[in-house]
Structures are given as C-alpha cells and as structure tokens.
C-alpha cells in the first residue's frame, strides 16, 4: 500500500474492509478482547491497536484482509505521529491558555461525560 | 470544593476561571510550555495537564485560582478514570468490531486529519 | 516550508472596507501552534501590529485599530482574511500576513493598498 | 498600552560593529525579538529570544537584553547588512505585539 495514501482515504477504505471481512473476523467465538466502556475514543486509541493486534494473530491472512490489518497498522502510525506531535512546540502561556481553552470548550460541548 | 459537582459543571466553572485569572496566569512572560499542534485532543491530554503542572508551579496561588488548579485537578482525575475504562471489560469480537467501526467513523467524520 | 500569500484589491476607495485573504501552503492552518496575524507597514515607516487570530476563532486586535477590524479563519481553504472598515488615505500601507509562532516565523512578500478616490 | 523605542538611524563603516538599541520599560523582563528588513522585502528574524539566533543567521548578528534597553549587535559589519532593523516584544497584560519604529542602518562606503 503506497504510504502516500491521504489518511482520510485510508480511514474510509479501512470502514468499508471491515464491513467486507466482518465474517471472518467473527469467526472465533472464544475470543475476548477489552472494548472500552465510553465513547471518548481518542484516549483509548492504546488499547484499540493491541485488540486489533490480538484480533490479527487470531485471523487466518491472506487477500483483502491482510489489507485491512495493513491500513489499521497505517492508522495507527499515523496516531502515534500525531501523539508525537502533541509536545513538540513550546509557546507562551498565551498560547498554552488559547490551546487549553478549547481543549475545555471541546470537552463542555462534544465529550460524552459520564458524572 | 466537593467532588460530587458533575464532570460537565466543573469544566464549564474551569472555563470561566481560567478567563478570569488570565492575565495573572500570562504574566510569567518568558516561560514557554509544550502546545500541540494538532486539534485532537484528546490524544494530548497526558501533555495539557504537564503543562498545567508547570504553570501552577509559576503562579502565585491564593483567591480563585487556586480553585482554577483545583478543578483541572479534578478533570484529570475524571480523564484518567476514563483512560482506566479503556481496558476494563473484555468482550467478545463482535462488539470489539462495533466499537471499531463506532472509533474508525468517528475519525472520519470528527477528527482534523492532515495528510 | 510555510510560505504565505496575500490577495486582494491594491486600490480602495475612502470609507469603504479593505479586504485581504491570505493563503497558507506547505502546511495546515489547523496547526495549533501557531497564529495567523496580519502586519502593516506605512510608506517609510515602521511596521505596525494589526491582529492576529488563533484556529480556535479567538482573535486579538490592536487597540487602535479593534473598532474597525475584523480577523477570520476558513480552515476549508488554508485561508485568513483581514477586513478593515472605513479606510481613510492613512490606511495606505504595505500589508502583509504573518505566522506566528513566539515571534513571527514566515511571512507574506507583503501587498500595497491604495486608498485613494 | 507598551511602547518600545528605537533610534531612527545608525551608521557604521564597514569591518565596525553596530549597536541598535530598543527602550522599554523593564524590557528585560521580556523576550526581545529583531527583524532585518531590505527595501521591498518582508522582514526577517535575525534573533529571537533576547540573544538566540534562527538557523542561517551569521554569528556577526548577536543580541543582549537588560534594564531598561534591549540590544542588537552586528559585529564585522558588511555593505549586505544595510537594512532597517525593529524590534518586538509582547505585551502581555494584553496578548498583544509590540513593534520599535524601526532603525535604517546605513553602512558607510
């Protein structure tokens, strides 16, 4: 898969594989995997990739669905790039407050907080 | 402060705050502290809360900001309790693959993606 | 490498508004490390502060010139735009769009307004 | 609102050092930033931070910053080097930027 790939498009294409290869994946019946217990997804984004990694080790590869654990594996580079990114500028206190600010503003208006 | 007051209360308190106490806050006008530079978040949050350790270490306390402090106490304590929901209940494929899809979807449509 | 590009109307007429946008390429004005801010400078003079704006919307103006000025950001397009109203031939000035970061990083190549009937 | 004062020229011969200062009040609580301006070009960091230097910037240029008086300094002054010189600072009981006037110096031949 060419790394050039816009993530965007790549998370579309992953969408539709996962629905394509569903099946499959459900297969074993055994197997449990952590599922987090709400629906702020980024600070989970750890424990998504290693139960997508258990999931991998537990499919038989070949075709499509190599594809798709290819593009999860891409998603999650991209992920970690943006973690990396998330110390890299030191600004002023102006700056920090305006970024923390709308960290405040995003979590009053679209976290789904449970009390 | 008593730490029955609701997630969402606390947050929307944190947020008049820290417009209160704002120019206290900037007045330190050589210290830089770590911004990301993207707008997810919630990929961040270990970094925001570094940050706010390190300006509470250059703020003069007293009066209501120290009730600023107290409260982005409180929503760390709340965002790390969320961090430790991430793992807790292990399920079986199918709704790991639900929660996949819920994750993948939302990056598509909520998440500021730059290729 | 950022680079900064300014565009608008180099003639305006008094009392009307003064509209530049600035394109961002070689990277995203999502970035949250920086502000976008605009710059003018009079013909031989020093360079003056106008406003510059963070992607979050927050903005912060000159004093002299807040009552007039407007600073937005289209992210869709990796756009800034600064509107001035009521010009006046002493809004004559080379402009310019500016990145900053804690000091000014990248700069526009700068556009001459004219105001003038 | 803060003001910042530069003198409006300075001259030097070439192989001299130039100073250019930038008044303030209690500047040297603040970061000092210098921009290097040639005729019909947008300005250029040649300092920030009081006296640190952006990459490509000659070590000739250097900066100090105490007091009341924030200084630029080119050392082994070259003909290039002519140019108009401003400061900046934040002001931040305001959020907001601060310029000098700006200083043209001029290199004597």
């Known amino acids: 898969i060419p790394t050039e790939i816009p993530t965007s498009a790549l998370v579309k294409e992953t969408l539709a594989l996962l629905s394509t290869h569903r099946t499959l994946l459900i297969a074993n019946e055994t197997l449990r995997i952590p599922v987090p217990v709400h629906k702020n997804h980024q600070l989970c984004t750890e424990e998504i990739f290693q139960g997508i990694g258990t999931l991998e080790s537990q499919t038989v590869q070949g075709g499509t669905v190599e594809r798709l654990f290819k593009n999860l594996s891409l998603i999650k580079k991209y992920i970690d790039g943006q973690k990396k990114k998330c110390g890299e500028e030191r600004r002023r206190v102006n700056q920090f407050l305006d970024y923390l600010q709308e960290f405040l503003g995003v979590m009053n208006t679209e976290w789904i907080i449970e009390s | 402060i008593p730490t029955e007051i609701p997630t969402s209360a606390l947050v929307k308190e944190t947020l008049a705050l820290l417009s209160t106490h704002r120019t206290l806050l900037i007045a330190n006008e050589t210290l830089r502290i770590p911004v990301p530079v993207h707008k997810n978040h919630q990929l961040c949050t270990e970094e925001i809360f570094q940050g706010i350790g390190t300006l509470e270490s250059q703020t003069v306390q007293g009066g209501t900001v120290e009730r600023l402090f107290k409260n982005l106490s409180l929503i760390k304590k709340y965002i790390d309790g969320q961090k430790k929901k991430c793992g807790e209940e292990r399920r079986r494929v199918n709704q790991f693959l639900d929660y996949l899809q819920e994750f993948l979807g939302v990056m598509n449509t909520e998440w500021i993606i730059e290729s | 490498q950022v680079q900064l590009q300014e565009s608008g109307p180099g003639l305006v007429k008094p009392s009307q508004t003064l509209s530049l946008t600035c394109t961002v390429s070689g990277g995203s004005i999502s970035n949250a490390g920086y502000y976008w801010s605009w710059i003018r400078q009079h013909p031989g003079k020093g360079l003056e502060w106008i406003g510059y704006?963070?992607?979050?919307?927050?903005?912060y103006y000159n004093p002299s010139l807040k009552s007039r000025v407007t600073i937005s950001v289209d992210t869709s397009k990796n756009q800034f735009s600064l509107k001035l109203s009521s010009v006046t031939a002493a809004d004559t000035a080379v402009y310019y769009c500016a990145s900053l970061g804690n000091w000014f990083d990248y700069w526009g190549q700068g556009t001459l307004v004219t105001v003038s009937s | 609102s803060y003001v910042l004062t530069q003198p409006p020229s300075v001259s030097v011969a070439p192989g001299q050092t130039a100073r250019i200062t930038c008044g303030g009040n209690?500047?040297?609580?603040?970061?000092v930033y210098w921009y290097q301006q040639k005729p019909g070009q947008a300005p250029v960091l040649v300092v920030h931070d009081d006296s640190d230097r952006p990459s490509g910037i000659p070590e000739r240029f250097s900066g100090s910053n105490s007091g009341n008086t924030a200084t630029l300094t080119i050392s082994r002054v070259e003909v290039g080097d002519e140019a108009d010189y401003s400061c900046?600072?934040?002001?931040?009981?305001?959020?907001?930027?601060?310029f000098g006037g700006g200083t043209k110096l001029t290199v004597l031949g």
């Open positions: 704006i963070y992607y979050s919307g927050s903005t």
């Open positions: 900046q600072v934040w002001d931040s009981s305001s959020d907001h930027v601060v």
């Open positions: 209690n500047i040297g609580s603040k970061n």
